[in-house]
Interface confidence: medium
Amino acid sequence: TVPPMVNVTRSEASEGNITVTCRASSFYPRNIILTWRQDGVSLSHDAQQWGDVLPDGNGTYQTWVATRICRGEEQRFTCYMEHSGNHSTHPVPS
């Protein structure tokens, strides 16, 4: 088992909104849960955009999930990752 490296980034979207993207990379096996949570509970599938789980050329995999949120509400959102029985939570950077 190779645990993922998780990285959260933010980018400007429409006025008053930002897009937050959570990327998991260099993990094996390929089964992974990656989702955005608001106040601790997962957003609906429709509120998130998902990348395919793709091989990254090193025998490991990568994927991403993104969502759009209101600027100023960043602290309410975290990226939740679960892989091979381990989980971690990652905040939106300031």
Epitope: R37, Q38, D39, G40, V41, S42, L43, S44, A47, Q75, R76, T78, H87, T89, H90, P91
Partner: antibody
Framework: QGQMQQSGAELVKPGASVKLSCKTS????????ISWLKQKPGQSLEWIAW????????SYNQKFTAKAQLTVDTSSSTAYMQFSSLTTEDSAIYYC???????????????WGQGTLVTVSA | DVLMTQTPLSLPVSLGDQASLSCRSS???????????LEWYLQKPGQSPKLLIY???NRFSGVPDRFSGSGSGTDFTLKISRVEAEDLGVYYC?????????FGGGTKVEIK
């Protein structure tokens, strides 16, 4: 399940501040969301704010943004709430409570501290 | 803020009776993820509240099956099929779907 042990009763003067503690044990502190709630004698409950122990991220009930400040100390698995500029309206029992998002996929205040009575009086 | 209104304020019961408690929200409390985060708590005198029901109808661990929750949208009900002495106290409904999260005013279940 774990335990949540709150600090003892406080008698404070109007205008002062008070810092309440909620020491936890028996679960992985950094995985948890912890909320603070207020209950005046004979009345219902009000949610003040939550803090995610893993990151220190917070979300406040707008009514309490100028009054409450939540922090955690991961080394001692303790959550704190500082309440400032106290008035007699702040006299109440304050509870800390742990959310249970993993075990039940969405139960808010699954486990509670015993409460701390704060009395504001001149 | 979402206003949670509980009725009745007081519910006198005889032990062994069925009790029905009502909770109405001022707006729909479906969370943006599709779940309805409506919970019921029981607070006995001098104690912290205890979680009974989460997500409208799910009993929390250790809660007897005489407690059941139902409802949708804005109208919710907690039923106690056969009231026992340990069930007496104040019951609060709570919504966790919209911030700020809010509680109802409570229903006091007491001996008739």
């Amino acid at each position: 399940q774990g335990q949540m042990q709150q600090s003892g009763a406080e008698l404070v003067k109007p205008g002062a501040s008070v810092k309440l503690s909620c020491k936890t044990s028996g679960f992985t502190f950094s995985d948890n969301y912890i909320s603070w709630l207020k209950q005046k004698p004979g009345q219902s409950l009000e949610w003040i704010a939550w803090i995610y122990a893993g990151t220190g991220g917070t979300s406040y009930n707008q009514k309490f943004t100028a009054k409450a400040q939540l922090t955690v100390d991961t080394s001692s698995s303790t959550a704190y709430m500082q309440f400032s500029s106290l008035t007699t309206e702040d006299s109440a029992i304050y509870y800390c409570a742990r959310h249970d998002y993993y075990g039940t996929s969405g139960a808010w205040f699954a486990y509670w501290g015993q409460g701390t009575l704060v009395t504001v009086s001149a | 803020d979402v206003l949670m209104t509980q009725t009745p304020l007081s519910l006198p019961v005889s032990l062994g009776d069925q009790a029905s408690l009502s909770c109405r929200s001022s707006q729909n409390i479906v969370h943006i993820n599709g779940n309805t985060y409506l919970e019921w708590y029981l607070q006995k005198p001098g104690q912290s509240p205890k979680l009974l029901i989460y997500k409208v109808s799910n009993r929390f661990s250790g809660v007897p099956d005489r407690f059941s929750g139902s409802g949708s949208g804005t109208d919710f009900t907690l039923k106690i099929s056969r009231v026992e002495a340990e069930d007496l106290g104040v019951y609060y409904c709570f919504q966790g779907s919209h911030v700020p999260w809010t509680f109802g005013g409570g229903t006091k279940v007491e001996i008739k």
